[in-house]
């Protein structure tokens, strides 16, 4: 083979290369990108000898070997601000054709941080000695250089260009020359794979004469993976050499006919391809022996098969078709499991909704949050449910629980609260007096006062405005009632004073009972009936001390 | 734009042989596969082969072996099928496809507006 | 070879409604990378054949997304979200798994 002009190594679905020059890393990344590739990354240890080789290749073909460290860029840098993160492998530095933060590393030093200035990452060669395969270059972090000043000791850099595929290097059954171009525009004679898209010249004969013949083909996609130069046969055949010129070309057996031409075969197990020249493993899957949407996975030597069924369906016992997974058996909801065809479906029961940790799982809606809350006054949240509450003076109301309406103090079944007038409002009640009385410091009694004519005492009503003539009874005439503290239980009686704050309705106390002074009388604080969301059934009273808050959207919302 | 210009409809004699062409413009002719479809009247469409003009590498459907002869011209930018023997089971439409991308091998986005073969005596 | 199977017309559709086209295959054409070599292609009356979804459920260029496809390893099913007057033709799909490729028989979308 002929001296190849450039250092590249191909393996896997993609190729290196490298190259002398003192460039910044970012001249050197212009390179890369001119002819479709990035600086390399060495994101394992595998990719790290694959650049180890294309720097032992460019090293060889420097004449003399000079006494000193050289450095070769790769494709790590760190953004300037973007600082250090010793907990990670990359330390916070990233690959220029980006792709994941990862495992692989192989610092030379313990890095200083610095997040003042771009960062960039070389490899440090020792120029004088070869290249060990146990001994792969170290990473050595610096400034990224610029324009004429590229940075101590850097020598050179190193692509990288990725492939959909390669294709195997064509095989000569005599006398010949190959030499690949390869789509980054690198030319080669010794590439162990050759990426998609490169081109082949193949020169026969022994290249001082004239009978020599030449071939071209193109690395191309024939079929899902199948990539191919599109050859029939050995080239260069010459029946001078027969099967012994590099097994006449072919993959596993070579076979010579009584005239100078050969055949190429294959071991039992082994099929020969349409190139006449490689053999691949005899497909077993062929005679499509899997059903119901398996995948035929050939075995080894093409001896037997798998069938191999897509995600969510599993191999039933003839172990050719495939079924339904029943995912719902392995329990992976939290509450509520819905197999489908391949794959299954989690729900949750009415008051949850998805989220929480884990895949599947359920929390409890907040039907009380804010904006969201379906009581009137109180609302508490439960798990997978709520109850509403109402303030004092109110009891719930409505088909759904969720509404508070007006308890009527003056009409309760506790009796009289007043011991003259009642006046029902919002929420409360108030006391009053017929005229010549005046209510007592308590709220609740009347003591006999000044003679006067005109309406009872106690504030007048929007609603009865110039019903009555006469002045209202003096702020001094009313009492300042007051609640029993917050946190009292619900079902303790308690002596309730009326509130005198509001305008209300007046309610005459049935004559019977109306008397100059006397006792007050007990009164009840109604009990707060407790809805859930399902059921709508009322809890007993008691226990529930909890405050309520005015929400955004004029309802009541608590928690 | 990428265009497929095929040759015009062709009335030919029992055992005779037929060449077709297929201009290709607007890309790089030699780097993409062309194939090759036919579609007898009233019915569906059959793949015969294919060409990759960069390197002449062809594909053929077993049946059409024998039947029918890819080749490309890279210096006109155009796609040839030869029919031979031909039969009227050979009376057809035949449309040259274009893959989508360079070297790779599927799918067809782009047709030529097809040529009418007839065979009758 | 591989062999694609089409019925020959599809249910009536109205227009504006939804309407869908099935295929099948005698063996499955995903592939061990994980992609599915299942194609379909549109022929409108006189015309050449036009892809629209390529590699089971990838829209081709230029195609409405009125159009989906989905599938198994062997059954497919073209979708179209809102039928129009201009999809009337006849649905091909087709394997490119395989050499051969090959092509169903196609289906004739019906208005009703």
């Known amino acids: 083979t002929g001296a190849d002009t450039e250092a590249v190594v191909c393996a896997g679905t993609a190729c290196y290369t490298a190259h002398w020059g003192k460039l910044s890393a970012a001249e050197a990344q212009n390179l890369c990108l001119q002819n479709g590739g990035n600086l390399a990354t060495v994101k394992s240890e595998e990719e790290a000898q694959h650049v180890q080789q294309v720097l032992a290749q460019l090293l060889r073909r420097e004449a003399a070997l000079t006494a000193r460290m050289g450095k070769f860029w790769i494709g790590l840098q760190r953004e300037k601000g973007k600082c250090l993160d010793p907990s990670l492998p990359l330390k916070g530095f990233s690959w220029v054709g980006g792709g994941e933060d990862t495992p692989y590393s192989n610092w030379h030093k313990e890095l200083r941080n610095s997040c003042i200035s771009k960062r960039c990452v070389s490899l440090l060669l020792d120029l004088s000695q070869p290249l060990l395969p146990g001994r792969l270059p170290k990473w050595s972090e610096g400034p990224c250089g610029s324009p004429g000043s590229p940075g101590s000791n850097i020598e050179g850099f190193v692509c990288k260009f990725s492939f959909k595929g390669m294709c195997r290097p064509l095989a000569l059954g005599g006398p010949g020359q190959v030499t690949y171009t390869t789509p980054f525009q690198t030319t080669s004679s010794s590439l162990e794979a050759v990426p998609f898209a490169s081109a082949a010249n193949v020169a026969c004969g022994e290249g001082d004469k004239d009978d020599s013949q030449s071939h071209y083909f193109l690395c191309k996609e024939k079929a899902p993976d199948v990539f191919d130069w599109g050859s029939s046969g050995p080239l260069c055949v010459s029946p001078k050499y027969g099967c012994n010129f590099n097994n006449g070309g072919c993959h596993q057996d070579c076979f010579e006919g009584g005239d100078g031409s050969f055949l190429c075969g294959c071991r039992p197990g082994f099929r020969l391809l349409d190139d006449l020249v490689t053999c691949a493993s005899r497909n077993p899957c062929s005679s499509s022996p899997c059903r119901g949407g398996a995948t035929c996975i050939p075995g080894p030597h093409g001896k037997n098969y798998t069938c191999r069924c897509p995600q969510g369906y599993q191999l039933d016992s003839s172990q050719l078709d495939c079924v339904d997974v029943d995912e719902c058996q392995d329990s992976p909801c939290a509450q509520e499991c819905v197999n489908t065809p391949g794959s299954f479906r989690c729900e949750c029961w009415v008051g949850y909704e998805p989220g929480g940790p884990g895949e599947g799982a359920c929390q409890d809606v907040d039907e009380c949050a804010l904006g969201r809350s379906p009581c009137a006054q109180g609302c508490t949240n439960t798990e997978g449910s709520f109850h509403c509450s109402c303030e004092e003076g109110y009891v719930l109301a409505g088909e759904d629980g969720t509404q508070c309406q007006d308890v009527d103090e003056c009409v309760g079944p506790g009796g009289p609260l007043c011991d003259s007038l009642c006046f029902n409002t919002q929420g409360s009640f108030r006391c009053g007096c017929l005229p010549g009385w005046v209510l007592a410091p308590n709220g609740v009694s009347c003591a006999m006062g000044p003679v006067s004519l005109g309406p009872p005492s106690g504030p007048p009503d929007e609603e009865y405005k110039g019903e009555r003539e006469g002045s209202t009874v003096p702020p001094a005439a009313t009492a300042s009632p007051t609640r029993g503290p917050e946190g009292t239980p619900k079902s303790t009686p308690t002596t309730r004073r009326p509130l005198l704050s509001s305008d209300a309705p007046i309610t005459s106390v049935p004559l019977e009972v109306l008397a100059p002074s006397g006792s007050p009388g007990l009164w009840r604080e109604p009990s707060i009936h407790h809805t859930t969301a399902a059921s709508g059934a009322q809890e007993p009273a008691g226990g529930d001390s909890s405050v309520a808050t005015q929400n955004d959207d004029g309802t009541d919302g608590q928690k | 734009q990428v265009q497929l210009q095929q040759s015009g409809p062709e009335l030919v004699k029992p055992g005779a042989s037929v060449k077709i062409s297929c201009k290709g413009s607007g890309y790089a002719f030699s780097t993409y596969w062309m194939n090759w479809v036919k579609q007898r009247p009233g019915k569906g469409l059959e793949w015969i082969g294919r060409?990759?003009?960069?390197?002449?590498?062809?594909d053929y459907d077993g049946k059409f072996k024998g039947k029918a002869t890819l080749t490309a011209d890279k210096s006109s930018n155009t796609a040839y099928m030869q029919l031979s023997s031909l039969t009227s089971e050979d009376s057809a439409v035949y449309f040259c496809?274009?893959?989508?991308?360079?070297?790779?091998?599927?799918?067809?986005?782009?047709w030529g507006q097809g040529t009418l073969v007839t065979v009758s005596a | 070879d591989i062999v694609m199977t089409q019925a020959a017309f599809s249910n009536p559709v109205t227009l504006g409604t939804s309407a869908s086209i099935s295929c099948s295959s005698t063996?499955?054409?995903?592939?061990?990378?994980?992609?599915?070599?299942l194609y379909w292609y549109l022929q409108r009356p006189g015309q050449s054949p036009q892809l629209l979804i390529y590699?089971?459920?990838n829209l081709a260029s230029g195609v409405p997304d009125r159009f989906s496809g989905s599938g198994s390893g062997t059954d497919f099913t073209l979708r179209i979200s809102r039928v129009e007057a201009e999809d009337v033709g006849v649905y091909y799909c087709?394997?490119?798994?395989?050499?051969?490729?090959?092509f169903g028989s196609g289906t004739k979308l019906e208005i009703k």
């Open positions: 060409i990759f003009p960069g390197d002449g590498d062809t």
């Open positions: 496809a274009r893959t989508g991308a360079a070297y790779e091998f599927d799918p067809f986005p782009y």
């Open positions: 087709a394997q490119m798994l395989e050499r051969p490729f090959t």
């Open positions: 063996k499955s054409l995903l592939h061990s990378s994980g992609i599915t070599y």
């Open positions: 590699r089971m459920s």
